[in-house]
């Protein structure tokens, strides 16, 4: 007996071939001997089966002695043995229909779990193997679970169902809802405008929810809500914003915040959360602000940085086109009695400059002593 695997909702074509290459009488029946379809001359006739409106054939093949049974919009309960009667012969085909579905929405938040459930006909014992977009394989029986979804799990999951040495492939599109970056860092000189961007790693037609940016300034003892906003069909509207700092927010995606100027008291780290409609849990993105200030006070040239810097970052003071006068893995460096010229304060990571501030030191003219 030939075995054919089908997918729920799909179309399957069961073949039946006569030895004579001409149109002759044929009938397709199910295991209960109920007629599904057949022919009367060159015309298709249908029987009283439950497949009536979903069964078809290809009349253009009958002249070659081919009498296929096409079943549209397959259901699990269509799994059965189908019998083609032609030329006093009986051809039996066992059809097994499987369905694979994500038990929840296919749009899941980063860190959530994905469960895939296999629907199969009674008496079958299939095995399932799924491959994630990043190439990770998972195996199972009737259910497969993946915990702690990551951004790289977004995309098409390819699942293969194996039964009687035959296989059928399912493709399920999974969207992991997350920000493109888990964390970002912005380096700015004091007084510069700061742009924070929070691009999403997914696109959906309608996006509705609400969000908030909490900020923990380095100098402050507790965190503070800087802004709250609503998102309706990808349109952003601000609900509440602090007076200091007075943040501005873009009206369209990607989420975009502007801080009019970088000041040492704002240096620190923030957490933007986004709660999406009909989703439990929130999306998070951490954002950090590092502010640099270079000052000259009497005979002391100082360079300072505020905010979350890594211990391996180097802070240097150097006269333009010369070697660094001072270079330390600290948040403040200074030079006493600096020479006249353009001084550069540099914050660098393994030789790569992250932030630079220039300050001009004027020559000091010593007043001649009167005789």
């Amino acid at each position: 007996k030939k075995v054919v695997l089908g997918k729920k909702g799909d179309t399957v074509e069961l073949t039946c071939t006569a030895s004579q290459k001409k149109s002759i009488q044929f009938h397709w029946k199910n295991s209960n001997q109920i007629k599904i379809l057949g022919n009367q001359g060159s015309f298709l006739t249908k029987g009283p089966s439950k497949l009536n409106d979903r069964a078809d054939s290809r009349r253009s093949l009958w002249d070659q002695g081919n009498f296929p049974l096409i079943i549209k919009n397959l259901k699990i309960e269509d799994s059965d043995t189908y019998i083609c009667e032609v030329e006093d012969q009986k051809e039996e085909v066992q059809l097994l229909v499987f369905g694979l579905t994500a038990n929840s929405d296919t749009h899941l938040l980063q860190g959530q779990s994905l469960t895939l459930t296999l629907e199969s006909p009674p008496g079958s014992s299939p095995s399932v193997q799924c491959r994630s977009p990043r190439g990770k394989n998972i195996q199972g029986g009737k259910t497969l679970s993946v915990s702690q979804l990551e951004l790289q799990d977004s995309g098409t999951w390819t699942c293969t169902v194996l039964q009687n040495q035959k296989k059928v492939e399912f493709k399920i599109d999974i969207v992991v809802l997350a920000f493109q970056k888990a964390s970002s860092i912005v380096y700015k000189k004091e007084g510069e405008q700061v742009e924070f961007s929070f691009p999403l790693a997914f696109t959906v037609e309608k996006l509705t929810g609400s969000g908030e940016l909490w900020w923990q300034a380095e100098r402050a003892s507790s965190s503070k809500s800087w802004i709250t906003f609503d998102l309706k069909n990808k349109e952003v509207s601000v609900k509440r914003v602090t007076q200091d700092p007075k943040l501005q927010m873009g009206k369209k995606l990607p989420l975009h915040l502007t801080l009019p100027q970088a000041l040492p008291q704002y240096a620190g780290s923030g957490n933007l959360t986004l709660a999406l409609e009909a989703k439990t849990g929130k999306l998070h993105q951490e954002v950090n602000l590092v502010v640099m200030r270079a000052t000259q006070l009497q005979k002391n040239l100082t360079c300072e940085v505020w905010g979350p810097t890594s211990p391996k970052l180097m802070l240097s003071l150097k006269l333009e086109n010369k070697e660094a006068k001072v270079s330390k893995r600290e948040k403040a460096v200074w030079v006493l009695n600096p020479e006249a010229g353009m001084w550069q304060c540099l914050l660098s990571d393994s030789g790569q400059v992250l932030l630079e501030s220039n300050i001009k030191v004027l020559p000091t003219w010593s007043t001649p002593v009167q005789p």
Partner: antibody, heavy 120, light 107 residues
Framework: EVILVQSGGALVEPGGSLKLSCSAS????????MSWVRQTPEKRLEWVAA????????YYPDSVKGRFTISRDNAKNTLYLQMNSLRSEDTAIYYC?????????????WGQGTTLTVSS | DIQMTQSPSSLSASLGGKVTIACKAS??????IAWYQHKPGKGPRLLIH???TLQPGIPSRFSGSGSGRDYSFSISNLEPEDIATYYC?????????FGGGTKLEIK
């Protein structure tokens, strides 16, 4: 002899509507699935609608879904195509075509074609 | 939808000669391909269906072959009346799609 005679082509403004007809003779009309196919000015052939022998099923490509409606009157041996919300890209020669038999069969006989021009 | 890529878009051959047209499907179409001849002012004419089955009344100079995604159509011993545009059609599923057409000219 299978004969399919078409009518209804016209010049229509964008957003307008038009109904094409195809009168069949020389075969038992009610035993065959029917279709409409168009040839664009670039000479590409595009299938635009299909209907099963007793109107049980109708099929459309995404490009016309919701705007075009195929129907048939087996008593009058006539096939129709109602076209609404017409766009300039619907400009084409429209052919009615008989399917070899059922929904899954290729087209074996075609009408002579009727021209639709969508322009302001 | 299944895409059908037909090549070449035009070709020129001598009377008595042979031409071959190819159609490549974007997925396996299980031999459900038909070939049509189309002349200006007329409806297309079915020549071959199910890859290689010749329609009644079509001369055996016309032939078709292929499987899976790749199919070809040939005309041998070219005659003046073969000047036309030829199209392939996939009918594997209910969303039928045509190839872009090949315009045949005689040298």
């Amino acid at each position: 002899e299978v004969i399919l005679v078409q009518s209804g082509g016209a010049l229509v403004e964008p957003g307008g509507s038009l109904k094409l007809s195809c009168s069949a003779s020389g075969f038992t009309f009610s035993n065959y699935a029917m279709s409409w196919v168009r040839q664009t000015p670039e000479k590409r052939l595009e299938w635009v609608a299909a209907i099963s022998d007793h109107s049980t099923n109708t099929y459309y490509p995404d490009s016309v879904k919701g705007r075009f409606t195929i129907s048939r009157d087996n008593a009058k041996n006539t096939l129709y195509l109602q076209m609404n919300s017409l766009r300039s890209e619907d400009t084409a020669i429209y052919y009615c075509a008989r399917k070899y038999g059922g929904d899954y069969d290729p087209f074996d006989y075609w009408g002579q074609g009727t021209t639709l021009t969508v322009s302001s | 939808d299944i895409q059908m890529t037909q090549s070449p878009s035009s070709l020129s051959a001598s009377l008595g000669g042979k031409v071959t047209i190819a159609c490549k499907a974007s997925q396996d179409i299980n031999n459900y391909i038909a070939w049509y001849q189309h002349k200006p002012g007329k409806g297309p004419r079915l020549l071959i269906h199910y890859t290689s089955t010749l329609q009644p009344g079509i001369p055996s100079r016309f032939s078709g072959s292929g499987s899976g995604r790749d199919y070809s159509f040939s005309i041998s011993n070219l005659e003046p009346e073969d000047i036309a545009t030829y199209y392939c059609l996939q009918y594997d599923n209910l969303l039928f799609t045509f190839g872009g057409g090949t315009k045949l000219e005689i040298k």
